[in-house]
């Protein structure tokens, strides 16, 4: 009988660690952000790109904020971050303004304590996009692991945003907490 | 549609400088190279060269460096064209044009006749 | 720069035949797998107006009549069946390399 009542009380400390830890997991922080295809600025100048998606598609976002174009930490910890950004053309749209583009991203890391901002990733390449192909396209893709406080933020800087590939599976960024500071 | 008025005529002096205007409409201005070509009277097309709207990018031919000067205005989305030190040799229709969403140059000005007479 | 000679300078085509213009490049005007030259019509006080562009695609409105061929130097604008409102000057063109250029023109008068 004891043994019964021993088991029986494992199983029930066993749901509650399962609980726990689900609930524990349901806490953990991630975001993973799409580009918004409305609000990309113009031009070939290196810019901030403040305008993501959070809740439709794939994007999704949980325990952590956007705002103002920035992904902010609400839970200290060490977070892996990641950003892939994809450039096109194809000649119906227009015409290059030139034929040697610098194309890149820089993943940045702000503090508002103290306030600083720092680089956290950079991918990219010098391109020749010959005005004479009918089709361009160019992939970069950055992750990295990274220790992160409460209340800094993430944002994302291109060069060439007008020619950015508007699609969700093509331009985002997100980030998901691996495990607490010690 | 793709639209683009030119200037009206110019009669100016041997010496003297012309400003001719492309005003564009029915497209983003920024977005696409405008060209100029000069066409004297009875005589073939000559490119001179050609506008990048947005940053103000500009290309050449060789003959026409040191003659035309091309700016754009892009919030009034008019590309211009100055010619300078005018001889009789000026003398001709100038076009605007832009290519279409393939290649080839699908859209033209209406064209503007300057004439260089003492 | 690429130079585009055109012949015949001018042409005398009677109403229902055929015409044929040429248009030879100084040096190759291919590349990416495409031809970068286009034909023109211009008649007399108007601008001219694009007919065939990259070679052999005809562009939007333009009468069936009216086809190119040809790759790397060597052009052909044919007019199947010439009727009366095809008299006018044809020119070649080649947005392949800066400076873009034009060929000479050539006259076509209908009998």
């Known amino acids: 009988g004891s043994q019964h009542i021993r088991a029986e009380k494992a199983m029930v400390d066993g749901s509650w660690l399962d609980l726990a830890k689900r609930s524990k997991l349901e806490a953990q922080p991630f975001a993973h952000l799409t580009i918004n295809a409305t609000d990309i600025p113009s031009g070939s100048h290196k810019v901030s790109l403040s305008s993501w998606y959070h809740d439709r598609g794939w994007a999704k976002i949980s325990n952590m904020t956007f705002s103002n174009g920035k992904l902010i930490v609400n839970q200290d910890g060490f977070y892996y971050l990641y950003a892939n950004i994809c450039f096109r053309h194809h000649e119906t749209s227009g015409d290059l303004a030139t034929e040697y583009l610098q194309l890149m991203v820089y993943v940045t890391k702000t503090s508002i304590k103290i306030p600083s901002s720092h680089t956290l990733m950079k991918g990219g390449s010098t391109k020749y996009w010959s005005g004479n192909s009918e089709f361009h396209f160019y992939s970069i893709n950055v992750g990295g692991f990274f220790k992160l406080r409460s209340g800094e933020e993430i944002s994302i800087e291109v060069s060439n945003p007008s020619l950015l590939d508007p699609d969700q599976d093509a331009t985002y960024f997100g980030a998901f907490k691996v495990r607490d500071i010690d | 549609q793709v639209q683009l008025q030119q200037s009206g005529a110019e009669l100016a002096s041997p010496g003297a400088s012309v400003k001719l205007s492309c005003k564009a409409s029915?497209?983003?201005?920024?977005?696409?190279?405008l060209q100029w070509v000069k066409q004297r009277p009875g005589q073939g097309l000559e490119w001179i060269g050609a506008i990048y709207p947005g940053p103000g990018n500009t290309k050449y031919t060789q003959k026409f460096k040191d003659k035309a000067t091309l700016t754009a205005d892009k919030s009034a989305s008019t590309a211009y064209m100055q010619l300078n030190s005018l001889t009789s040799e000026d003398s001709a229709v100038y076009y605007c044009?832009?290519?279409?969403?393939?290649?080839?140059?699908?859209?033209w000005g209406q064209g503007t006749l300057v004439t260089v007479s003492a | 720069n690429i130079v585009l000679t055109q012949s015949p300078a001018s042409l005398s085509v009677s109403l229902g035949q055929r015409a044929t213009i040429s248009c030879r490049a100084s040096?190759?005007?291919?590349?990416?797998?495409?031809?970068?030259m286009h034909w023109y019509q211009q008649r007399p006080g108007q601008a001219p107006k694009l007919l065939i562009y990259l070679a052999s695609n005809l562009e939007s409105g333009v009468p069936a009549r009216f086809s190119g061929s040809g790759s790397r130097t060597d052009f052909t604008l044919t007019i199947s069946s010439v009727e009366a409102e095809d008299e006018a000057t044809y020119y070649c063109q080649q947005d392949n390399e800066d400076p873009y250029t034009f060929g000479g023109g050539t006259k076509l008068e209908i009998k």
């Open positions: 044009a832009r290519r279409g969403s393939r290649r080839g140059i699908a859209y």
């Open positions: 029915g497209y983003t201005f920024t977005t696409y190279w």
């Open positions: 040096e190759s005007v291919d590349s990416y797998g495409r031809s970068f």
